[in-house]
Interface confidence: medium
């Protein structure tokens, strides 16, 4: 806590400038009004303050806001967002994507804090839900940002808001997260034809079910492996050789590398081993000729 | 807007001093930095060192430190900077700069140290 | 004392992006640092780009940002333009010292 002592004749700050750096802690604490500094927040960035007097600053800001601080100031905290605890944060009523875009800026280049979480957090619940420009930003500052929410937050993303999402920002994803945003993403991207849908499509299709997969087949996709061994298993298992043939097109012969990876080992397990052979792949696994496949799961559901 | 005016060009002898001004107009001046950085023919640019007219106190780069002096005088909104004994390499354009930020700078002055 | 490392030179094309990179030592560019760039056109004065590592002084174009990672800043200017050919140099103010530190500058060439 810093002491209250009187400022010295003549150190009055008037305005927020570059004199104040060699204002002692006690002198900007005793000198500058903290009404002056709410307003002059926008200079404070253009001063390079050490961190013990961004504390001294925060401390003003805090003393005449204490119920949290106006947007209008946080647009303009800078640096001083660094200073900011999750606490701090929580009373703040963030509208504005300016706003968040300003905040984002200063913690660029860094993992995301406990201040940046609880940023978005406010803003998101502020929003009601995640639109595409908040999405676009978000995912422009942390690639990994929609996988870092839950299921249930991600309910909360609308169908359009799918059209700001690229690949690389589903790398994270979780299968119960791709179930949760597959849907979504097979409705935002319905209207577009075969080719395009399916390069928007790809990314999300871990999510995505037999029947959809079974679909896909009959369209000349050529899925290639990588996108393959993402896919959900129990999606993948009831898939016949063909269909996997014609969903992978040139790249089935990819299958023989991955043989010992689910799902296509999974897979293998489940084929006729004679219609395995019909590959030519070398693929080993399958049920021999003569056996009898039980569908346990199917007789469950009628009983 | 803000606007630094320096002097004209000077030509020097190895082992003289030369002394270029900066003239501060239409906004604050005593409270914000004037720095002086120089820039040698197809070289980068070298900070020299600054000064807060208000406080008075200059600081320098080391490099230059005891052969630069950079003054201010509140009253004319002007800000110095001194360079002493010449030699060959000190050949090229100073610039004066405002705020730590620089930024607004000065026209530029060509010192050249031939003999 | 501090110093800071710029490629000596970069090109793109008109319309591409491109980054230039400026990179010290943990002292200088690593947790809180002041870093600033500057824009300077052949017999012209230097122009400030950037301060504070991402603020755009008014008047510049959004097309040029500013970040940092470690010890490393960058200046992304995206969409080139032929008026961005010129020289470019990264500053960094040093707490300990006072001092500010250029780098040696970058120059541009947009194809």
């Known amino acids: 806590e810093v002491e209250k002592t009187a400022c010295p004749s003549g150190k009055k700050a008037r305005e927020i400038d570059e004199s104040l750096i060699f204002y002692k802690k006690w002198e900007l604490e005793a000198c500058v009004d903290a009404a002056l500094l709410a307003t002059q927040m926008d200079r404070v960035n253009a001063i390079p303050f050490t961190y013990e007097q961004l504390d001294v600053l925060k401390h003003k800001l805090d003393e005449l806001y204490p119920q949290g601080y106006p947007e209008s100031v946080i647009q303009h905290l800078g640096y001083l967002f660094l200073k900011m605890s999750p606490e701090d944060i929580r009373k703040w009523n963030v509208t504005s994507l300016e706003t968040l875009k300003a905040l984002l800026e200063v913690n660029k280049g860094h993992e995301m804090s406990p201040q940046v979480a609880t940023l978005i957090d406010r803003f998101v619940k502020g929003r009601g839900q995640l639109d595409k420009d908040t999405l676009d930003t978000l995912t422009a500052f942390y690639p990994g940002y929609l996988c870092s929410l839950s299921p249930e937050e991600l309910s909360s993303v609308p169908p359009s808001s799918i059209w700001a999402v690229r690949p690389q920002d589903l790398d994270t994803c979780d299968p119960r997260q791709l179930d949760v945003l597959y849907p979504k993403a097979r409705l935002a991207f319905q209207n577009m034809n075969g080719s395009e849908y399916f390069v928007k499509i790809q990314s999300f299709l871990g999510g995505a079910p037999t029947e959809d997969l079974k679909a896909l087949s009959q369209q000349n996709v050529s899925m290639d492996l990588a996108t393959f061994m993402k896919l959900r298993t129990d999606a993948v298992l009831p898939l016949t050789v063909a269909e996997v043939q014609k969903l992978l097109g040139p790249h089935v012969e990819g299958l023989k590398a991955e043989e010992r990876h689910r799902p296509v080992r999974d897979w293998i397990l489940r084929q006729r081993q004679d219609d395995l052979d019909t590959l030519g792949l070398g693929l080993q696994g399958g049920i021999p000729n003569g056996y009898l496949v039980l569908d346990l799961s199917m007789q469950e559901a009628l009983s | 807007q803000v606007q630094l005016v320096q002097s004209g060009a000077e030509v020097k002898k190895p082992g003289s001093s030369v002394k270029v001004s900066c003239k501060a107009s239409g906004g604050t001046f005593s409270n914000y930095t004037i720095s002086w950085v120089r820039q040698a023919p197809g070289q980068g640019l070298e900070w020299m060192g600054n000064i807060i007219p208000a406080f008075g106190y200059a600081n320098y780069a080391q490099k230059f430190q005891g052969r630069v002096t950079i003054t201010a005088d509140e009253s004319t909104s002007t800000a110095y900077m001194e360079l002493s004994s010449l030699r060959s390499e000190d050949t090229a354009v100073y610039y004066c700069?405002?705020?730590?930020?620089?930024?607004?700078w000065g026209q530029g002055t060509l010192v050249t140290v031939s003999s | 004392d501090i110093a800071l490392t710029q490629p000596a030179s970069v090109s793109g094309s008109p319309g591409q992006s491109i980054t230039i990179s400026c990179t010290g030592t943990?002292?200088?560019?690593?947790?809180?640092?002041?870093v600033s760039w500057y824009q300077q056109h052949p017999g012209k004065a230097p122009k400030l780009m950037i301060y504070?590592?991402?603020n755009r002084p008014s008047g510049v174009s959004n097309r040029f940002s500013g970040s940092k990672s470690g010890n490393t800043a960058s200046l992304t200017i995206s969409g080139l333009q032929a008026e961005d050919e010129a020289d470019y140099y990264c500053?960094?103010?040093?707490?300990?010292?006072?001092?500010?530190?250029f780098g040696g500058g970058t120059k541009l060439t947009v194809l």
């Open positions: 943990s002292s200088d560019l690593g947790g809180y640092s002041y």
């Open positions: 504070n590592v991402n």
């Open positions: 500053s960094s103010y040093d707490y300990v010292s006072s001092d500010t530190v």
């Open positions: 700069a405002r705020k730590f930020t620089f930024d607004v």
